[in-house]
């Protein structure tokens, strides 16, 4: 999904006449069209800030199949999407929700739960240092032939 706009919700003002863009910006929830501030369409597009240069509203984000919708798109705020329960958004792949691990490797203990923003957190029992990286057993692989694993995916 696109980066979420979490600006506070504002009430869209009615359409207003303007003689030039410098007279004053269109309000959040509006865009400039032929000298007029026109409203965005509820649930379809939005503008989150007052503006005097946007010639169209911004299309609302649609949450993808790995996400849940926390709040719908309004004329002044984009949809807010969050990874579904049991998955998290990786820093290096922010468009994807990845499955959280359910346990820590041997010799480690869980100190942090799965959240929509992070995998479970594991630390070494003795040293207390964090574990980074995958549990080898859940490495992503593809088949080279039925029932035969090939090397891990990128």
């Amino acid at each position: 999904i696109t980066q979420q706009d979490l600006a506070p919700q504002q009430r869209a003002a009615p359409q207003q006449k303007r003689s030039s863009p410098s007279e004053g910006p269109c309000l959040a929830g509006q865009y400039l069209s032929e000298g007029n501030c026109k409203p965005c369409r509820e649930g379809i597009d939005y503008t989150s800030h007052s503006n005097h240069s946007l010639d169209s509203c911004i299309l609302c984000t649609r949450c993808d199949s790995g996400e849940v919708e926390l709040s719908p798109c309004t004329t002044t705020r984009n949809t807010v999407c969050q990874c579904e329960e049991g998955t998290f958004r990786e820093e290096d792949s922010p468009e994807m929700c990845r499955k959280c691990r359910t346990g820590c490797p041997r010799g480690m203990v869980k100190v942090g739960d799965c959240t929509p923003w992070s995998d479970i957190e594991c630390v070494h029992k003795e040293s207390g240092t964090k574990h980074s990286g995958e549990v080898p057993a859940v490495e992503e692989t593809v088949t080279s032939s039925p029932g035969t694993p090939a090397s891990p995916c990128s």
Epitope: D64, S65, G86, V138
Partner: antibody, heavy 118, light 107 residues
């Protein structure tokens, strides 16, 4: 070694039910999603549904809702799909598939052929 | 549901030549499009994820492109083992859907 070992071919009578199994090895199914995909003879691929074995949450294609029921037994690292009220059009190879991400299928079982015949 | 349409249904190409397979979505799916190869009697295997991301173990001659509704799988120089059926799949919205497949055959 990562593997999805599916149960053997089944011949079943119309109206009956069948339960297919998919035993995972080399990984913990709770750390992945398990999907099932149908392929009728000489036809393309159809996604049936998905389960998150960690919490049991399922999603189905509406056309398979009521036809397929996907479950898991995490203690044996096995996924199941039960097909009910079988008809000749349910004759197909059924694949269990896994994904670390829900969006695509990174590892496929060898498939189970289900033949519905009187 | 999102309908995935692949073209052509059958593509005849000589070994060593380039093959271009197309996949169209009935609505925008961003880059949430994945390609699979299936040989007779075998399970499909993942070739390309997210329209253009390569998969370790898949030869570099396989590449993908596209975004929105139009996607392409290109095989730069066909090898004998590449003749198979290719499927695209969208993972953007439920239910997940596949294209009907393109059969790549030897000319």
């Amino acid at each position: 070694e990562v593997q999805l070992q599916q149960s053997g071919a089944e011949v079943v009578k119309p109206g009956a039910s069948v339960k297919l199994s998919c035993k995972a090895s080399g990984f913990n199914i709770k750390d992945t999603f398990i999907h099932w995909v149908k392929q009728a003879p000489g036809q393309g691929l159809e996604w049936i549904g998905r389960i998150d074995p960690a919490n049991g949450n399922t999603k189905y294609d509406p056309k398979f809702q009521g036809k397929a029921t996907i479950t898991t037994d995490t203690s044996s690292n096995t996924a199941y799909m039960e097909l009910s009220s079988l008809r000749s059009e349910d004759t197909a190879v059924y694949y269990c598939v896994r994904g670390l991400y829900t969006y695509y299928f990174d590892y496929w079982g060898q498939g189970t052929l289900v033949t519905v015949s009187s | 549901e999102i309908v995935m349409t692949q073209s052509p249904a059958t593509l005849s190409v000589s070994p060593g030549e380039r093959a271009t397979l197309s996949c169209r979505a009935s609505q925008s799916i961003s880059n949430n499009l994945h390609w699979y190869q299936q040989k007779p009697g075998q399970a499909p295997r993942l070739l390309i994820k997210f329209a253009s991301q390569s998969i370790t173990g898949i030869p570099a001659r396989f590449s993908g492109s596209g975004s929105g509704t139009e996607f392409t799988l290109t095989i730069s120089s066909l090898q004998s083992e590449d003749f198979a059926v290719y499927y695209c799949q969208q993972g953007n919205s439920w239910p997940y859907t596949f294209g009907q497949g393109t059969k790549l055959e030897i000319k």
